[in-house]
Interface confidence: low
Amino acid sequence: CEEPPTFEAMELIGKPKPYYEIGERVDYKCKKGYFYIPPLATHTICDRNHTWLPVSDDACYRETCPYIRDPLNGQAVPANGTYEFGYQMHFICNEGYYLIGEEILYCELKGSVAIWSGKPPICEKVLCTPPPKIKNGKHTFSEVEVFEYLDAVTYSCDPAPGPDPFSLIGESTIYCGDNSVWSRAAPECKVVKCRFPVVENGKQISGFGKKFYYKATVMFECDKGFYLDGSDTIVCDSNSTWDPPVPKCLKVLPPSSTKPPALSHSVSTSSTTKSPASSASGPRPTYKPPVSNYPGYPKPEEGILDSLD
């Protein structure tokens, strides 16, 4: 027989020879990182027809790392469903908890023993520091010092000292989200008042009033013989300006060489009208999120979030 077969999990005891006589036996042992479980044979014999009798390495099992229980409030998920060396253990936390430590541990061979590459992580409850206080306003639960995951607070504006009220700019409700960061920037309370919109050769058809506060919406149409240059709908935005700008009504001039088009009494040059929330003008305020400062809690990324108008 020629050289005996080679295997992934077991190796020949001694050095292989170029050829073996009929009846000669070779023995294998489990490779490093594998252990033998009886009773399967780990030897073979050179048969009369010059082939080796069948043998497999099924008796050699990969070393396994110690069992890891699910962390409290989370899960340990073995990749490929095995604890054998060369594989990974993934850790995930339940909703409302975040991982402290390694998300993945590797089952590694140290000598002949399979051990994990590090300590299992833990799942810690998501907690937020109190949300920011805002000028001219307040939020619910202002006496609470620690907020849990999905706890929500709602902002409202104080009564204004003058004739015009404070408007709440942004979302009134925010909640404690993943990574111990509030779901969005705190809103703003300020007086927002747009000038009375005057359109010559046109008229207001909705949104009548003497004062125009935040998100007030006005619609226009032009007099007969005039067409609308701009949007027929405008909204008072957070900077006390109309968005889009107040339109104009321009006179329809008949073309010199062609028949005038049949016009209705108002024509808009704008093919689409913007919804109140679809645009903003002027600089957008920025806000740095609160940073968790409880011992054992990692600081969230110190990014800057845009406030939502």
Epitope: F35, Y67, I68, R69, L72, A114, K119, P120, P121
Partner: antibody, heavy 122, light 111 residues
Framework: QVQLQQPGAELVRPGASVKLSCKAS????????INWVKQRPGQGLEWIGN????????NYNQNFKDKATLTVDKSSSTAYMQLSSPTSEDSAVYYC???????????????WGQGTSVTVSS | DIVVTQSPASLAVSLGQRATISCRAS??????????MNWFQQKPGQPPKLLIY???NQGSGVPARFSGSGSGSDFSLNIHPMEEDDPAMYFC?????????FGSGTKLEIK
């Protein structure tokens, strides 16, 4: 379901070593530690040691280091504890119990055998 | 070794009332944010039965009247309301590190 089966009683002559068995079933034997606990009549519980069947790694209570030897037979899912040179002080109930592992600490002994009552007497 | 001190040694409680057993470890048994303190119930002629693991988690099939609390080195087991089936020896045990150590036990009886 998880079961740890132990013989009910063993009578031992002083000085003659005895090997207690604990046969596990209903779970993956190599994935949990097997612990041994001693309880003398009317007394508390004393942890002797534990063994991890996958690689036969052992931890011993120093008080039992020279008294107990822990082994396993993976093929039969059985754990053993051999008590050497028994004296009347070794007369007690010996329990085997399974435990789970977490990092460098252990969860509780969640399943127990019924215990083997060892009597050392001439 | 971590020494576990349990009190009281014995306790008599009326049916329907609350029983509280305390356990103190000679050092903190917290690790990875988990308290490795466990509680067992043992009735005569039977092996110990796991009641509470990791300080406050109920073992499988354990009635809700058994609850555990505490962290660091101070722990307690509460039984409320006390029922006919509850008289037994109760042991606490730390599993933070080997050797595991047990409290000396509390004998709970009906008053």
């Amino acid at each position: 379901q998880v079961q740890l089966q132990q013989p009910g009683a063993e009578l031992v002559r002083p000085g003659a070593s005895v090997k207690l068995s604990c046969k596990a079933s209903g779970y993956t034997f190599t994935a949990f530690w097997i612990n041994w606990v001693k309880q003398r009549p009317g007394q508390g519980l004393e942890w002797i040691g534990n063994i991890y069947p996958s690689d036969s790694y052992t931890n011993y209570n120093q008080n039992f280091k020279d008294k107990a030897t822990l082994t396993v037979d993976k093929s039969s899912s059985t754990a053993y504890m051999q008590l050497s040179s028994p004296t009347s002080e070794d007369s007690a109930v010996y329990y085997c119990a399974r435990s789970d592992y977490y990092g460098s600490s252990y969860y509780a002994l969640d399943y127990w055998g019924q215990g083997t009552s060892v009597t050392v007497s001439s | 070794d971590i020494v576990v001190t349990q009190s009281p040694a014995s306790l008599a409680v009326s049916l329907g009332q609350r029983a509280t057993i305390s356990c103190r470890a000679s050092e903190s048994v917290d690790n990875y944010g988990i308290s490795f303190m466990n509680w067992f119930q043992q009735k005569p002629g039977q092996p110990p039965k796991l009641l509470i693991y990791a300080a406050s988690n109920q073992g499988s099939g354990v009635p809700a009247r058994f609850s555990g609390s505490g962290s660091g080195s101070d722990f307690s087991l509460n039984i409320h309301p006390m029922e006919e089936d509850d008289p037994a020896m109760y042991f606490c045990q730390q599993s933070k590190e080997v050797p595991f150590t047990f409290g000396s036990g509390t004998k709970l009886e009906i008053k």
